[in-house]
Interface confidence: medium
Amino acid sequence: MAVTACQGLGFVVSLIGIAGIIAATCMDQWSTQDLYNNPVTAVFNYQGLWRSCVRESSGFTECRGYFTLLGLPAMLQAVRALMIVGIVLGAIGLLVSIFALKCIRIGSMEDSAKANMTLTSGIMFIVSGLCAIAGVSVFANMLVTNFWMSTANMYTGMGGMVQTVQTRYTFGAALFVGWVAGGLTLIGGVMMCIACRGLAPEETNYKAVSYHASGHSVAYKPGGFKASTGFGSNTKNKKIYDGGARTEDEVQSYPSKHDYV
């Protein structure tokens, strides 16, 4: 029960996290114009990874894409790359984890295979979360060090949104979404890795308990293992059928709910 719950919860948490990473990557509010000390007449400006937007004082909003790759700051390119890598890894991780879920039966897939897949997806989620956190943090650092302002003139060729009046930029909503989403993906990945340990079939060595019966000796092996003849045998036992006493978490499973931000 505990293993399935951990795995299922890890999957759901990661799913929400990856949806959040996708949302953050697509959002335009990575950096927003600081509204403190801002005139009523000024246009409110905010920028994302892909385009820059202005909201006029009348309420009309217009966005223009960055129609160049070479003119963009290297740091912005790096943030884009980190977020995309995070999304790709997360998406692959989700795909792998779906097949790894205990509640989903695929043919005669063994628990060891599911455990490996759970571990793989868990690692992918951890790396995905770290990529998102790193990307958002790099961008936040750019804002803090006024890097964004120093490259504002580069956006002239990306729709011509020229900014010659000094404007302060602050953290946009996308940064917080990215941090939370990255954290959730990371937590989900850790949960998957924890679940993996519970899924892996333990290869336990059982000490034979000898019974002296008339005629021949039998070493009795308990719980779902075939008894083998031979007195005091200490050989490794192979599970040959699935009909032994099941643990609670092998019997019960909970379906995962899919969510999208």
Epitope: V40, T41, V54, E56, S57, S58, F60, E62, T167
Partner: antibody
Framework: EVQLLESGGGLVQPGGSLRLSCAAS????????MTWVRQAPGKGLEWVSS????????YYAASMKGRFTISRDNSKNTLYLQMNSLRAEDTAIYYC?????????????WGQGTLVTVTS | DIQLTQSPSFLSASVGDRVPITCRAS??????LAWYQQKPGKAPELLIH???TLQSGVPSRFSGSGSGTEFTLTISNLQPQDFATYYC?????????FGGGTKVEIK
């Protein structure tokens, strides 16, 4: 080089109409807010109307709202001011001005002005 | 509406003088103020924006200061070409307003 050239001024009777034009060159016209400012003979500067870069947001001085209409054609790099129901107090030199940025209405470039005279 | 009051409205000075021009706003406008110079028969020219930022190409003898309601344009070493009319303008809120102007003449 940034250039703003106004035209369309002239003599008009009270109650009449006039359309001023401002041809812009030397900058990405659609990326800047544009403004009309007037100056009555021997008087100070008076803000008339402003228009955002997109052309979607318009702003007018109270005394001109409803009578004047500001517009722009970004494909022609031209700013317009349609003036209706003109009064004697509208007599002034009308300047077309470019905003310093998309975001603030400081005027870094001005046209040479066009004189509008409203008299009977 | 925000009223801008310039003082003095008329100023007589000599070449080399340090000339201060004051602009008072009827309410706080932070630093959203510009200064323009206008010579007879010409269009105004932007000297300073954001209360203290010198516009490119403008000589460094022009400087702006102040915040809130009180602003000053200072010409540190008055030159013959500086004899003109100076206007302040606020961009804090609509309607945009200009001061009445300060005419600087040769003594």
């Amino acid at each position: 080089e940034v250039q703003l050239l106004e035209s369309g001024g002239g003599l008009v009777q009270p109650g009449g109409s006039l359309r001023l034009s401002c041809a812009a060159s030397g900058f990405t016209f659609s990326s800047f807010a544009m403004t009309w400012v007037r100056q009555a003979p021997g008087k100070g500067l008076e803000w008339v109307s402003s228009l955002s870069g997109s052309g979607r947001s318009t702003y007018y001085a109270a005394s001109m709202k409803g009578r004047f209409t500001i517009s722009r054609d970004n494909s022609k790099n031209t700013l317009y001011l349609q003036m209706n129901s003109l009064r004697a107090e509208d007599t002034a030199i009308y300047y077309c001005a470019k905003s310093l940025s998309y975001y603030h209405y400081y005027f870094d470039y001005w046209g040479q002005g066009t004189l509008v005279t409203v008299t009977s | 509406d925000i009223q801008l009051t310039q003082s003095p409205s008329f100023l007589s000075a000599s070449v080399g003088d340090r000339v201060p021009i004051t602009c008072r706003a009827s309410q706080g406008i932070s630093n959203f103020l510009a200064w323009y110079q206008q010579k007879p028969g010409k269009a105004p020219e932007l000297l300073i924006h954001s209360a203290s930022t010198l516009q490119s190409g403008v000589p460094s003898r022009f400087s702006g200061s102040g915040s809130g309601t009180e602003f000053t344009l200072t010409i540190s070493n008055l030159q013959p070409q500086d004899f003109a009319t100076y206007y302040c303008q606020q961009v804090n809120s609509y309607p945009l307003t200009f001061g009445g102007g300060t005419k600087v003449e040769i003594k």
